[in-house]
Structures are given as structure tokens and as C-alpha cells.
Interface confidence: medium
């Protein structure tokens, strides 16, 4: 294997998985173990990410791509490329500085991550509460109180078009 010399940067011939080795008159050397180069023409290889502790390996490092991590059970990823692992809580809880705490009355969290959010205020939409909220579930809004008055049709008529030319949803 003889690398052809050209007027362009000789390192541009080095493919992903190699680096342009200054110690060897700029021939393309393979990346050392536990390192990678994802693009051609690199003068160094990059150190593979190591998924340690609360991180676990989702994808092994190869000579051309970095390792990818996710989180061990009981934790979830945060940040670009799973840069952090955050403790899971139960549904109906949120993570605080003091650990997992139950959602306050009037709030809920239906996931193992994130914060408790206020129940929907049905009355703002002119609706009534059909099913009460819990720490784990939002309220379910039903028809407005007027719709449920005696003699009112149980079939909800179509809502008017909000703009001309738009058919009802």
C-alpha cells in the first residue's frame, strides 16, 4: 500500500477510522483502541465515550463512531446525547433536591420524569369536570354545565367554523 502523493493536503486521503500520522510522514494510521474518527482527513482520533456508573452502553464505540450511552434502570437521560442521567420518580411525584416528592394537591405527573403540572381548569373552556384529577392523572373535562341542563340534546352540535372557508373540525 503506497499512498499517492498529490498537491492537496495528504491527510485528506485518510478515511474515517484512521488519522493522519505525523510520526509516519502523514500516512493513515488506524485509530488506537478505544478511540475513533468519524470523518476523513483527521489528524487525531477522539477518545471513545465511556458509559460508566449510572450510564450504560447503548452502542459500542467503533473505529468510526463514538459510543452511545443511556441510563441504568431507575434513571432517564437528560441533555443532548444523554449527557446526564436523572433519577426516575413514580407517577404522581416529581424530583426535588430532597428526592422524589408527591405532587401537591391540584397538580399531577403521569410520567416517571419531569415536574408536577396543574390540573386543567375545565371552566376556562366553559366545560365541567367529568373525572376528578389525581396525583397521577389530569382531570377529564366534560361538556359545559349548560349542555347538561334538562331538555338539552345529548348530541353536541358541530362547532362553528372559526374562519370563513374552513370546515368544522
Amino acid at each position: 500500500f503506497e499512498r499517492t502523493r498529490s498537491l492537496q493536503d495528504p491527510c485528506s486521503n485518510c478515511p474515517a477510522g484512521t488519522f493522519c500520522d505525523n510520526n509516519r510522514n502523514q500516512i493513515c494510521s488506524p485509530c488506537p483502541p478505544n478511540s475513533f474518527s468519524s470523518a476523513g482527513g483527521q489528524r487525531t482520533c477522539d477518545i471513545c465515550r465511556q458509559c460508566k456508573g449510572v450510564f450504560r452502553t447503548r452502542k459500542e464505540c467503533s473505529s468510526t463512531s463514538n459510543a452511545e450511552c443511556d441510563c441504568t434502570p431507575g434513571f432517564h437521560c437528560l441533555g443532548a446525547g444523554c449527557s446526564m442521567c436523572e433519577q426516575d420518580c413514580k407517577q404522581g411525584q416529581e424530583l426535588t433536591k430532597k428526592g422524589c416528592k408527591d405532587c401537591c394537591f391540584g397538580t399531577f405527573n403521569d410520567q416517571k420524569r419531569g415536574i408536577c403540572r396543574p390540573w386543567t381548569n375545565c371552566s376556562l373552556d366553559g366545560k365541567s369536570v367529568l373525572v376528578n384529577g389525581t396525583k397521577e392523572r389530569d382531570v377529564v373535562c366534560g361538556p359545559s354545565p349548560a349542555d347538561l341542563s334538562p331538555g338539552a340534546s345529548s348530541v353536541t352540535p358541530p362547532a362553528p367554523a372559526r374562519e370563513p372557508g374552513h370546515s368544522p373540525q
Epitope: F1, N23, N25, P30, P33, I47
Partner: antibody
Framework: QVQLQQWGAGLLKPSETLSLTCTVY????????WSWIRQPPGKGLEWIGE???????NYNPSLKSRVTISVDTSKNQFSLKLNSVTAADTAVYYC?????????????????????WGQGTMVTVSS | DIRMTQSPDSLAVSLGERATINCKSS????????????LAWYQQKPGQPPKLLIY???TRESGVPDRFSGSGSGTDFTLTISSLQAEDVAVYYC?????????FGQGTKVEIK
Amino acid sequence: QVQLQQWGAGLLKPSETLSLTCTVYGGSFSGHYWSWIRQPPGKGLEWIGEVIHSGTTNYNPSLKSRVTISVDTSKNQFSLKLNSVTAADTAVYYCARGLLGECSGGSCYYGDAFDIWGQGTMVTVSS
Amino acid sequence: DIRMTQSPDSLAVSLGERATINCKSSQSVLYSSNNKNYLAWYQQKPGQPPKLLIYWASTRESGVPDRFSGSGSGTDFTLTISSLQAEDVAVYYCQQYYSTPWTFGQGTKVEIK
């Protein structure tokens, strides 16, 4: 544990071709440079050349015209051929592995200190 | 080629005393990109292949006793055996791996006085 085992003819006549082979047992064959180094009796060490799994080679300019180093990845072997030998080529020939790269500051560089050596083969050239 | 010159050629030291071997390269082997000196030290006993002691000028290979230490930068390097033991009798070589062809010093023979 990585071990290097080498073999080849030990007695040659002038103008013949020296031929040695080194087999790598254990560890990774790719990702390293594999070298041949020689040592004339009572003298110092001289690097002959190196090869990687892809077949890329580097040779010592002082020997380049007579040397061929090749690789057989299916057998984890690399070989040395030295043409037109003379008495000056009488030496113990060693195969050796280049140490792993050094990673610092987010980047990696090769470092070819030789961390693993074969047992050596004494090659005598005599008419 | 980078020429490696060792001094002295031979050295006789009493057991338990310090042995110091010098190595000088004809050009710097310090690589500015990673601030590493591309220099190694080897020990060779009769009938055996060389054994790597030190790489990156000062990093001890695993399993090497801590009485062996390497120092220096650029063109001037030193291998020190802080307290010579009987089993340290050998020839010691320095080697540069900064640029091909990789080259070795001529060797320093260490004996017991």
C-alpha cells in the same frame, strides 16, 4: 495475554533470502503496528520495518530496497523477507508489537514503544 | 534519521547505590500537540529480548519496579535506578518513536561494582 511466537530458517548462504514469520496469540491484531527489529551479535538494536493489519508498511530506508514485510490477518501472522543477505545480516531477529496509543486532551496519538517481543531467532549468514 | 546517543557505554555501581544513564537525541522528540516526549527505555538481559521499562519518557510500564524512573524532555533524557539490585545487571537502551525510522541508542551496560 498477548504472546508473539516467531520462526524461520536460522542458517543462510550469502545472496539467499531470509524469511521469518511471527504469530500473534491473544489480544487484538488490528489497531497495532507490528515490527521487525534485529540485533547483530554483541551490538545494538536496529528497527527494520513495520506493518499493520491493512497491509500498510513502513521500512527503515537503510534496508528498504531489500525488505518486504507482509501480513496474513486470517492467521494473525506477519512475515519478514530480506533479500540478498550477506554476513552483515547475521543477527538475532525479533518481532515486536507497538504499544497502544496515548490519549490526552481529548485526542489520541500513536506511540510505538515496543511492549511485547518475540523470543528472537538467530540468523547466521555464512558460506 | 534521529540519532540516539547514550552515555556512558558501561557503568559499575555498588548494590543499593544509584545508577544513572543518559540519552541524547539529535533532534527534539517532544511533540507539541500533546506535550509528550516520544522516548522509551528498555532493559535487556543476556539471551532475552528487550523488556520495556519506561515510555513517554517517564511512564513506567506496568509491573516495572518503582526504583526505575525516567526523566527529561526535548533532547536530553535520563534513566535512573534508585537502588541497584543484582537482577538489574543488564544492557539498557533508549529509543525514540517520534519519527520513522524508529532508532535506538547504542546501549549502556550496567554491572555491579
